[in-house]
């Protein structure tokens, strides 16, 4: 029942916005809009990991706004009724249904920009977001399975003779802990009601020529390695060093 090994190809790239909050977006530039997109009627779905407490911008299909009839954002969050934010070009009106989270808004006026933004992403923003654009040429969809990531707090210490404990506390999803060299380890994880997971690995090294051990924590938000020198004195506590 160990934690799943994260897919490091999904490591999040963020850029600084307003020198305060990291912001991430999967949006294309206008010049990237392809002429043949109108021929691709298939729905495009993207799995998107986003760090908690950053800003996220979600985009509609790259359709020129002049061709637009209606834009609808459909937002499905866990345990809540589906929220829709719609804009009708002909009457220049917007309408919202079952939308209660004030941090999820249009980036600007929808007649100028159809993108959706989430300000200060929280765990509650885990869910499915879909933009539906109605045009004379048909309906175009782009969906996002948004996975909110929480960086675990990593600690490593020696608590008994030749026994070390590595913890990745309150991460999302669960971190994966590995050791160099491998020891006699017991790893356990706990799922908290706020959606985070704590992983704890306790290892013992019987072989006395092992003097330094490294705990490597893999997580979608980034990897971390800590090392510690094993003390021979029983009961002595020693904290870890960060690579």
């Amino acid at each position: 029942e160990g934690a799943a090994q994260p897919n490091n190809s999904l490591m999040l790239q963020t850029s600084k916005e307003n020198h305060a909050l990291a912001s991430s977006s999967l949006c294309m530039d206008e010049k990237q809009i392809t002429q043949n997109y109108s021929k691709v009627l298939a729905e495009v779905n993207t799995s998107w990991p986003v760090k908690m407490a950053t800003n996220a911008v979600l985009c509609c299909p790259p359709i020129a706004l002049r061709n637009l009839i209606i834009i609808t954002w459909e937002i499905i969050l866990r345990g809540q009724p589906s929220c829709t934010k719609a804009y009708k070009k002909e009457t220049n009106e917007t309408k919202e249904t079952n939308c209660t989270d004030e941090r999820i808004t249009w980036v600007s006026r929808p007649d100028q920009n159809s993108d959706l933004q989430i300000r200060t992403v929280a765990i509650t923003h885990d869910g499915y977001y879909r933009c539906i654009m109605v045009t004379p040429d048909g309906n175009f969809h782009r969906g996002y399975h948004l996975q909110v990531l929480v960086t675990p707090e990593v600690t490593l210490f020696q608590n008994r003779n030749r026994t070390a404990v590595c913890k990745a506390v309150a991460g999302k999803p669960a971190a994966h802990i590995s050791w160099i060299p491998e020891g006699d380890c017991a790893t356990k994880q706990e799922y908290w009601s706020n959606g985070t997971v704590t992983v704890k690995s306790t290892c013992h090294w019987e072989v006395h020529n092992v003097s330094t051990v490294t705990c490597h924590v893999s997580h979608l938000t980034g990897n971390k390695s800590l090392y510690i020198e094993l003390l021979p004195v029983p009961g002595a506590k020693k904290s870890a060093k960060l690579y």
Epitope: K188, Q189, Y191, N194
Partner: antibody, heavy 119, light 108 residues
Framework: QVQLQQPGAEFVKPGAPVKLSCKAS????????MNWVKQRPGRGLEWIGR????????HYNQKFKDKATLTVDKSSSTAYIQFSSLTSEDSAVYYC????????????WGQGTLVTVSA | ENVLTQSPAIMSASPGEKVTMTCSAS?????MHWYQQKSSTSPKLWIY???KLASGVPGRFSGSGSGNSYSLTINSMEAEDVATYYC???????????FGGGTKLEIK
């Protein structure tokens, strides 16, 4: 299969100590936390605390910090809870329960030990 | 500490009747879990992660909710459902497990 075995009952005089046991089998003892839960007659459930058999790390509910002491014996895969000086308020069923797997909370419970404090 | 308040404390339902009990949390949660406890037996994990049924739980049970408000529903009451149901949450900061006061379900 996973089993947590507890004695059925303990009778204790007020002011006396008691040590309850919970013998685990059917899984690797050091790979899960062992929790203790109190239930007074006709009342709800209260989490007392938990211990990691791998390294004896303990977390207590502050309410029980001065009342209960948790220990383990890895060689016999047994967890213990010891109470120092019992009063009638401590008369209750005490359950051990396992946590720390892929399911949240306590997926496996012992049958409980009924502690009766009476002169 | 996140306080869980269950209501009603006691309820009774006729066979075939739909039953809903609620659990309110003083602090917002992502997941709520539920235990079933029958008379003189240990509690059993019944519903976890708000809406997932534990192994062996009949399909007439369901769980729902978000934020501070959660519920357990039985769409058609049966005699074997007579029990006390506890909502439950675990928090990592500070480390604490909390149970609601319980809803005792009886049959008419």
């Amino acid at each position: 299969q996973v089993q947590l075995q507890q004695p059925g009952a303990e009778f204790v005089k007020p002011g006396a100590p008691v040590k309850l046991s919970c013998k685990a089998s059917g899984y690797t003892f050091t790979s899960y936390w062992m929790n203790w839960v109190k239930q007074r007659p006709g009342r709800g459930l209260e989490w007392i605390g938990r211990i990691d058999p791998a390294d004896s790390e303990i977390h207590y509910n502050q309410k029980f910090k001065d009342k209960a002491t948790l220990t383990v014996d890895k060689s016999s895969s047994t967890a213990y809870i010891q109470f120092s000086s019992l009063t009638s308020e401590d008369s209750a069923v005490y359950y051990c329960a396992r946590s720390g797997g892929w399911l949240p909370g306590f997926a496996y419970w012992g049958q409980g030990t009924l502690v009766t404090v009476s002169a | 500490e996140n306080v869980l308040t269950q209501s009603p404390a006691i309820m009774s339902a006729s066979p075939g009747e739909k039953v809903t009990m609620t659990c309110s949390a003083s602090s917002s949660l992502i997941y709520m879990h539920w235990y079933q406890q029958k008379s003189s037996t240990s509690p059993k994990l019944w519903i976890y992660d708000t809406s997932k049924l534990a192994s062996g739980v009949p399909g007439r049970f369901s769980g729902s909710g978000s934020g501070n408000s959660y519920s357990l529903t039985i769409n058609s009451m049966e005699a074997e459902d007579v029990a006390t149901y506890y909502c439950f949450q675990g928090s990592g900061y500070p480390l604490m497990y909390t149970f609601g006061g319980g809803t005792k379900l009886e049959i008419k």
